[in-house]
């Protein structure tokens, strides 16, 4: 008799999840020699331990603490780039600007990027059929809790000037319900962080509006100012040119507005 299995609204665990996490961990230590002390088997065991045999709507930040401990990493606190709804460009930027870091440039972010995972209460099985959806099922699911935990720690570590890349093509350029809006903004430490600088990325070729005047950006400014952190905002009218100028800052066309 087939065992009854809870059907969730979200996609199931990414195929080859254990193999992918382990391989990513080894790759990360290969390309970041300063992390060679990390034991990837222990990292996988801690990752697995956070959600296996647990109800996938009952996951806590505490469940991820062993993994957080193993993945402890020091990134330059003044070189942090946050992003919201514009991951690809943020990653293209840190690929060129090698001294800046998104969460996915850290070990824990790199391990989980684009993956889905969940288990089942009282069985050691990974659920490849379905996992809880944040909206339709529950917010305390393994994936959401993981990103909330690592995002909070990442924001808490930031200092001096923190940059955030925002998607100017979205109806809500700043969304209070995004990970940036609900977690990172509230965990920047005013005693360490002097300024949050937003880069609003324009989508349209001929879009010359000042999106820094958008009501949602004003809302972000208000939240940040109330937390005793200064706020500044820049329009990035031409993201392609922006990246090109980061690559080749001495290019003559890079002195004008981008």
């Amino acid at each position: 008799v087939p065992r009854w299995r809870q059907q969730w609204s979200g996609p199931g665990t990414t195929k080859r999840f254990p193999e992918t996490v382990l391989a990513r961990c080894v790759k990360y230590t290969e390309i970041h020699p300063e992390m060679r002390h990390v034991d990837c088997q222990s990292v996988w065991d801690a990752f697995k331990g956070a959600f296996i045999s647990k109800h996938p709507c009952n996951i806590t930040e505490e469940d991820y603490q062993p993994l957080m401990k193993l993945g402890t990493q020091t990134v330059p606190c003044n070189k942090i780039l946050l992003w919201s709804r514009i991951k690809d460009l943020a990653h293209q930027f840190t690929q060129v600007q090698r001294d800046m870091f998104t969460l996915e440039d850290t070990l824990l972010g790199y391990l989980a990027d684009d993956l889905t995972w969940c288990g089942e209460f009282n069985t050691s099985k990974i659920n490849y059929q379905s996992c809880p959806d944040w909206r339709k099922d529950c917010s305390n699911n393994p994936v959401s809790v993981f990103w909330k935990t690592v995002s909070r720690r990442f924001a808490e570590a930031a200092c001096d000037v923190v940059h955030v890349m925002l998607n100017g093509s979205r109806s809500k350029i700043f969304d209070k319900n995004s990970t940036f809006g609900s977690v990172e903004v509230h965990n920047l430490q005013p005693e360490k962080v002097q300024t949050l600088e937003a880069w609003v990325i324009h989508g349209g070729r001929e879009d010359s509006r000042d999106l820094c005047q958008d009501p949602t950006i004003k809302e972000l400014e208000s939240i940040i100012s109330k937390r005793n952190i200064q706020f500044s905002c820049k329009n990035i009218y031409r993201p392609d040119k922006f990246l090109q100028c980061v690559k080749n800052p001495e290019d003559s066309s890079c002195t004008s507005e981008i």
Epitope: E19, A23, V26, K27, E30, I31, Q95
Partner: antibody, heavy 120, light 107 residues
Framework: QMQLVQSGAEVKKTGSSVKVSCKAS????????MHWVRQAPGQALEWMGW????????DYAQKFQDRVTITRDRSMSTAYMELSSLRSEDTAMYYC?????????????WGQGTLVTVSS | DIQLTQSPSFLSASVGDRVTITCRAS??????LAWYQQKPGKAPKLLIY???SLADGVPSRFSGSGSGTEFTLTISSLQPEDFATYYC?????????FGQGTKLEIK
């Protein structure tokens, strides 16, 4: 079994570019960093750079920074190394290589090599 | 960049001999060192990784030792197929670097 098969020998003119391919089989392409190493005739081995095939992220030796581009095609399980502004000193055997994850970070697997000859 | 200096550059020996090749690093590389064997027209073959671990399928007459800045590759009893060029490589830091090679010839 695990194999890295490289494209054939190339003869190129000074100032032109060459693109060498490395097709991986027998393993999950995205699970391993791919490196490129070259060896001029009678000379030592020289590391050029790496690519993470999963994300396309790269890093290059300073010496080649301005002239080398490593890319990949995930659907073809193939990595590419393009070297531009060729000069006679670039005449060499070019290899792709990867670790085994169980052998430290030494290169346990190598392509057969692609000879690039640069002539004026 | 980390420099690796191999000695000797050339070595003549006979079948059955015990030979030792040295690799000296310009800074501490812990045990992040590999040894390769290369024959003419062929790709290098990994012999030793992490300074002293034998790669799969490599005969036990090959051994590696050392850590920090001084490393050695020893072949306990030379066989005819061992005549080749040997390279050390550090993977402690990027850019990865190789020694200049030691050519082992038949006496």
């Amino acid at each position: 079994q695990m194999q890295l098969v490289q494209s054939g020998a190339e003869v190129k003119k000074t100032g032109s570019s060459v693109k060498v391919s490395c097709k991986a089989s027998g393993y999950t392409f995205t699970d391993y960093i791919m490196h490129w190493v070259r060896q001029a005739p009678g000379q030592a081995l020289e590391w050029m750079g790496w690519i993470d095939p999963e994300y396309g992220r790269t890093d290059y030796a300073q010496k080649f920074q301005d002239r080398v581009t490593i890319t990949r095609d995930r659907s073809m399980s193939t990595a590419y190394m393009e070297l531009s502004s060729l000069r006679s000193e670039d005449t060499a055997m070019y290899y792709c290589a990867r670790s085994a994850h169980t052998t430290g970070f030494g290169f346990a697997y190598w392509g057969q090599g692609t000879l690039v000859t640069v002539s004026s | 960049d980390i420099q690796l200096t191999q000695s000797p550059s050339f070595l003549s020996a006979s079948v059955g001999d015990r030979v030792t090749i040295t690799c000296r690093a310009s800074e501490d590389i812990y045990s992040n060192l590999a040894w390769y064997q290369q024959k003419p027209g062929k790709a290098p073959k990994l012999l030793i990784y992490d300074a002293n671990s034998l790669a799969d399928g490599v005969p036990s007459r090959f051994s590696g030792s050392g850590s920090g800045t001084e490393f050695t590759l020893t072949i306990s009893s030379l066989q005819p197929e061992d005549f080749a060029t040997y390279y050390c490589q550090q993977y402690n830091n990027y850019p990865y670097t190789f020694g200049q090679g030691t050519k082992l010839e038949i006496k």
